[in-house]
């Protein structure tokens, strides 16, 4: 029930924690499962047990195998198993899948990459970071405590990140590397009932007869990429294309904008050479998505020409 996979590279330090928990005061006995041989606690040994931790300083390929830990509490003993695999160092840059820790995802607002397993080691800064084997340089990358922060994350930042640090044990230093994949995702989006920003409900728009007029229908639908969201104009409850007045046209395509991070759409209605009969029409701005439809109505009124007195 309590088995945990651990892996490392030959000639690096590897520290494994017993999968069964216990208080620091509880004795933990470690055994090499295949031989049932007890792991020594003396630190002079290359492989030794230290409470809940099993230390390989450094690890060798021959150390691979299953190790048993027994936590001896005042009530019952509790047993865990550590399945340890030590691999030979790769000569090329590629990190094979079996050496990869869990993938983490980041976004523009949250781009922390934690160095896996580092909390088990006695390390001191600096922590070195590499992406696809290249040392990370530049002001966008900041190594902070046990994690890497990337400023202004872009999709190109996705890849395999390796942290490298030094473990110190009784004055001796051992190298440790750990690699994990980083993926870049869009910020979590959401959709909501359309909110029409313009025009206002029952707005009266002043126009000049004989001049051109533009009406803008603008609505927001949520955050992130939206599916099945649209804005459009209707004349007297009829689609513009079906109304049959060539002077009145919707602007081709819908302009997408992001206002305060919200996904919004605009549709402009263009009226050429405004006529008296246009003032009698009802102009409806419609915004619709999966949540439903919202309608704001606009009417046109004649703009009185300004009298110029001498």
């Amino acid at each position: 029930k309590f088995s945990k996979q651990s892996w490392g590279l030959e000639n690096e330090a590897l520290i494994v924690r017993c999968p069964r928990q216990g208080k620091p005061s509880y004795t933990v006995d470690w055994y090499y499962s295949q031989t049932n041989k007890s792991i020594p606690t003396q630190e002079r040994n290359r492989v030794f047990a230290s409470g809940q931790l099993l230390k390989f300083l450094p690890a060798a390929v021959a150390d691979s195998g299953i190790y048993t830990c027994i936590v001896r509490s005042p009530t019952f003993n509790r047993t865990g198993y550590a399945n340890v695999t030590i691999y030979k160092k790769q000569s090329d840059c590629n990190v094979p899948d079996y050496l990869m820790y869990s993938t983490v995802s980041g976004s523009e607002k949250n781009s922390k990459i934690y160095c896996p397993t580092i909390d088990l080691y006695n390390w001191t800064a600096p922590l070195e970071w590499f992406k696809n084997c290249q040392a990370l340089q530049g002001s966008r990358y900041r190594a902070h405590k046990s994690f890497l922060v990337i400023d202004n994350v872009m999709t190109e930042d996705a890849g395999d990140y390796t942290c490298k640090f030094i473990h110190n044990e009784n004055g001796a230093n051992y190298s440790v590397t750990a690699t994990r994949s980083f993926t870049v995702k869009d910020e979590q989006g959401f959709s909501l009932f359309p909110v029409i920003g313009a025009p206002a409900q029952n707005e009266i728009k002043e126009v000049e007869i004989g001049k051109n007029a533009n009406l803008t229908c603008s609505a927001c639908f949520g955050k992130g990429t939206q599916f099945l969201a649209a804005v459009l104009w209707q004349l007297n409850g009829t689609k513009i294309t079906d109304f049959g007045e060539p002077r009145i046209q919707q602007e081709e395509g819908q302009n997408q904008s992001f206002s305060n991070g919200l996904a919004c759409l605009d549709m402009v209605l263009r009226i050429a050479d405004v006529k008296e009969e246009d003032l009698l029409l009802q102009y409806d701005c419609l915004a619709l998505n999966l949540h439903g439809l919202r309608r704001h109505t606009v009417r046109l009124s004649r703009k009185n020409p300004i009298d110029h007195h001498s």
Partner: antibody, heavy 121, light 107 residues
Amino acid sequence: EVQLVQSGAEVKKPGESLKISCKGSGYSFTNYWIGWVRQMPGKGLEWMGIIYPGNSDTRFSPSFQGQVTISADKSITTAYLQWSSLKASDTAMYYCARHGTSSDYYGLDVWGQGTTVTVSS
Amino acid sequence: DIQMTQSPSSLSASVGDRVTITCQASQDISNYLNWYQQKPGKAPKLLIYDASNLETGVPSRFSGSGSGTDFTFTISSLQPEDIATYYCQQDDNFPLTFGGGTKVEIK
């Protein structure tokens, strides 16, 4: 199938003695601690004590120490809970439960169906 | 003895609701805490051991968390068959002790 089967309901008078049983099957009886839990009418669960049938090692809750005896017969894979002199306050449901091995433990994972003990004059 | 304080003592929730029960130990018990379900007239049944591990065969809507002195048991989406009393139990020290129980009913 791993199971614990308890003896049937008992009705006794105050001062009488009683021994109830719990038979284990489907697992290595001597390798697991087995214990007893009391539940008085309408109340919660109270841990009484355990025995390791492999060597008859026992542990008791101070509340039940000296009040009851826990024993086991590994030849017939059965654990026992007994009273030498029952009291009305012993009226309860008694459950036996398996408590893990000498080297591993993860809760009271197998329970008997319970034995109702009624003590009334 | 380690005292285990469970709350609430009873609750009523609708089918599909998220239900949370807390258990507090009078001293540090690491993660040595189990959760049991007892249906009326039945023996208790182990649901969660070592604070957060789901016992084999137990539906994934049940979960547990916590360490030290504060623990939480959650039913993510209450089902009619979850009507029962739930108990926490520590096994860090003898005597093993149970919480007082939480009776869960359907509204």
